[in-house]
């Protein structure tokens, strides 16, 4: 009997640190998103980046989903938000349009039960960037705790898409689960 | 037999405890690094900074290793990685090399096995730093979540490091493990 | 007995599992914290803030406690700290008092038991808001990991808090739990 | 690609300008580096430059060697009151992304002869 | 100041050769490796103290960090015969010479 009560007691608790394993990573989506160079829009007015890699480089995704642009929340909960975006402009690339620039970024939640769009975090500067100088660059980064809900979704808008900086290290988002919904 | 498996469960039970709040610490390694004051370079080159604190007023480390410059991963896993990086000039120092500046910082990743260096975050700004100010000031901070592997190697690299603030709230990096790798 | 023991066990495990559960939320507190705009000081000196918002919009508080513009630590932890400061002028506020301007924050500890203050993050910049643009922007993001005790206060100071943008979206601070002292 | 020139026989206490001319790069976040090295010697840095950073130079070149951008595609080495001692063949370099230790554009090098 | 050693070394067709190079202070991992054959421009081979430069061979290695650092030339064939250099690239406070005095390579 005893020996008996020991082995169930072992398997049991061999399932529970499967079953505290498996919790522990479940309850942890993040996602680390950068910016895909090849579909940078144009112009100067806010637009919303809708193509980011999820999956090359330092890019990666795991229990959230990427879809047309959004970064959609699959498990509820609370979660460190976060994006760096960089701009950059080179003499080389022609004159720019104006030299004083808006050069800003704003993380917005979209809910499908309710269409609407709410900023959660807005960065930037005014730059003034003259002639004077054959380079400029600036850099943006926010971050914030926030609930979110299964379906949410996560985006980014920025002004002036044209000089944002393809590389991996340079425009990026993302998110990670810190914590339950009490 | 009762009072028996009672007192053996309530003794695994303990030991389960013990081993969960070991592992759960042991899971999460941290390190908060402020820069070392007596050793910042001068010059405006690009450049691997070396010298930082690991044990004094708000810099500490917990199961990851910081030598010659360069935060050791000790430990597998999804990290959070932050830098906030200051730079000043004030008129008392002397005059600039130029007015024109990219101050800049990259927060890379090296692995001993394959000798290579990679940029997981940058950011910056391009600043024209005038004689008509006395003092000048510019902070950069940058974050974000990556997978980091036993053996791997994060250091901070930045341009203009002569002008560096050496205060350990103005000029610091760290990490934090989040979860571990599935 | 054996069916005893069992329905002991599932019990046993049950609170166990109440335990975990609770335990990891309560070891978790956390505070996302927005300003006031309703109390912003005039002027351009640094100051403290002590108007934030913990109840509505993304504003938030969970074992945590905020009190005369302070948010007080409950429970022995390390922390991630962060801030964002978004200062803003539009010429139809009428002209600034100089257009060469210091924008700055510092997230400070206050500790009761030694009344002393100290500065865990700066960052900020020198601008120079020149008459020709209508309109100026510029934020600022910090954040940190931090040991913190309980009874410990973290405080915000900024320098021209006349300039402060008073959306929910631009300027807040926060902290969360990520682990246990040793 | 880099290239020195104005490498000359000169008398001591001349002044001579030597001018390093780049192409497929700029100085917006490359750096131009000068070295020497003496017949039969090792290599000498004597300084760099680029545009976000300004110059910077070896102690003992300080006074009398000025290091200066003088176009979008040329940096001149500016020396005075030079000496026997500054008999050497002068090459210019780039220092990729500005990091000093990668110097990885070399040109072939113009001799400078200081002789009375 | 960096100190190179030894002044000169020779080694066989096959066989392996190590320079070392020594930092007065630390100068973390900003070290820099160029091999210079007589009546050329110096060659990039290591940079970062053990990142190889594109297009070099990985029969070189560079290794260490904060003031000791070695360079490893293994298999070592004829065309290896040259000087090799060290820098740094850290500081340009009270620099003499940014790079040491150089070790000569003689393949037998």
């Known amino acids: 009997g005893s020996q008996h009560i020991r082995a169930e007691k072992a398997m049991v608790d061999g399932s529970w640190l499967d079953l505290a394993k498996r919790s522990k990573l479940e309850a942890q989506p993040f996602a680390h998103l950068t910016i895909n160079a090849t579909d940078i829009p144009s112009g100067s007015h806010k637009v919303s980046l809708s193509s980011w890699y999820h999956d090359r480089g330092w890019a990666k995704i795991s229990n959230m989903t990427f879809s047309n642009g959004k970064l959609i929340v699959n498990q509820d909960g609370f979660y460190y938000l976060y994006a760096n975006i960089c701009f950059r402009h080179h003499e080389t690339s022609g004159d720019l349009a104006t030299e004083y620039l808006q050069l800003m970024v704003y993380v917005t939640k979209t809910s499908i039960k309710i269409p609407s769009s709410h900023t959660l975090m807005k960065g930037g500067s005014t730059k003034y960037w003259s002639g004077n100088s054959e380079f400029h660059f600036y850099s943006i980064n926010v971050g914030g705790f926030f609930k979110l809900r299964s379906g949410e979704e996560i985006s980014i808008e920025v002004s002036n898409p044209s000089l944002l900086d393809p590389d991996q290290d340079a425009t990026y988002f993302g998110a990670f689960k810190v914590r339950d919904i009490d | 037999g009762s009072q028996h498996i009672r007192a053996e469960k309530a003794m695994v039970d303990g030991s389960w405890l013990d081993l969960a709040k070991r592992s759960k610490l042991e899971a999460q390694p941290f390190a908060h690094l402020t820069i070392n004051a007596t050793d910042i370079p001068s010059g405006s080159h690009k450049v691997s900074l070396s010298s930082w604190y690991h044990d004094r007023g708000w810099a500490k480390i917990s199961n990851m290793t910081f030598s010659n410059g360069k935060l050791i991963v000790n430990q597998d896993g999804f990290y959070y990685l932050y830098a906030n990086i200051c730079f000043r000039h004030h008129e008392t120092s002397g005059d600039l090399a130029t007015e024109y500046l990219q101050l800049m910082v990259y927060v890379t990743k090296t692995s001993i096995k394959i000798p290579s260096s990679h940029t997981l975050m940058k950011g910056g700004s391009t600043k024209y730093w005038s004689g008509n100010s006395e003092f000048h000031f510019y902070s950069i901070n940058v974050g974000g979540f990556f997978k980091l592997r036993s053996g791997e190697e994060i250091s901070i690299e930045v341009s203009n490091p002569s002008l560096l603030d050496p205060d350990q709230d103005a000029t610091y990096f760290g990490a934090f493990k989040v979860r571990d790798i599935d | 007995g054996s069916q005893h023991i069992r329905a002991e066990k599932a019990m046993v495990d049950g609170s166990w599992l109440d335990l975990a559960k609770r335990s990891k939320l309560e070891a978790q507190p956390f505070a996302h914290l927005t300003i006031n705009a309703t109390d912003i000081p005039s002027g351009s000196h640094k100051v403290s803030l002590s108007s934030w918002y913990h109840d509505r919009g993304w504003a938030k508080i969970s074992n945590m406690t905020f009190s005369n513009g302070k948010l007080i630590v409950n429970q022995d932890g390390f922390y991630y700290l962060y801030a964002n400061i978004c200062f803003r002028h539009h010429e139809t506020s009428g002209d600034l008092a100089t257009e060469y301007l210091q924008l700055m924050v510092y997230v400070t500890k206050t500790s009761i038991k030694i009344p002393s203050s100290h500065t865990l993050m700066k960052g900020g910049s020198t601008k120079y808001w020149s008459g020709n643009s209508e309109f100026h922007f510029y934020s600022i993001n910090v954040g940190g990991f931090f040991k913190l005790r309980s009874g410990e206060e973290i405080s915000i100071e900024v320098s021209n808090p006349s300039l402060l943008d008073p959306d929910q979206d631009a300027t807040y601070f926060g902290a969360f739990k990520v682990r246990d002292i040793d | 690609s880099v290239e020195e020139s104005g490498g000359r026989l000169v008398t001591p206490g001349t002044p001579l300008t030597l001018t390093c001319t780049f192409s497929?790069?700029?100085?917006?976040?490359?750096?131009i580096n000068w070295v020497r090295q003496a017949p039969g010697k090792g290599l000498e840095w004597i300084g760099y430059t680029w545009s976000g950073g300004g110059t910077y130079c070896a102690s003992w070149a300080k006074g009398r060697f000025t290091i200066s951008k003088t176009s979008s595609t040329t940096v001149d080495l500016k020396m005075t009151s030079l000496t026997t001692e500054d008999t050497a063949t002068y090459f210019c370099?780039?220092?990729?992304?500005?990091?000093?230790?990668?110097?990885?554009?070399w040109g072939q090098g113009t001799l400078v002869t200081v002789s009375s | 100041v960096m100190t190179q050693t030894p002044a000169s070394v020779s080694g066989p067709v096959g066989g392996t050769v190590t320079i070392k190079c020594q930092a007065s202070q630390s100068i973390g991992s900003n070290l820099g490796w160029y091999q210079q054959k007589p009546g050329q421009p110096p060659k990039l081979l290591i940079f970062s103290a053990s990142n190889l430069e594109s297009g070099v061979p990985s029969r070189f290695k560079g290794s260490g960090s904060g003031t000791q650092f070695t360079l490893t030339i293994s298999d070592l064939e004829c065309d290896d015969a040259a000087t090799y250099y060290c820098?740094?690239?850290?500081?340009?406070?009270?620099?003499?010479?940014a790079f040491a005095g150089g070790t000569e390579v003689v393949v037998k």
């Open positions: 370099a780039r220092a990729y992304d500005s990091e000093w230790d990668r110097l990885d554009l």
């Open positions: 820098q740094q690239g850290y500081t340009t406070n009270n620099v003499l010479n």
């Open positions: 497929g790069f700029s100085l917006s976040n490359n750096a």
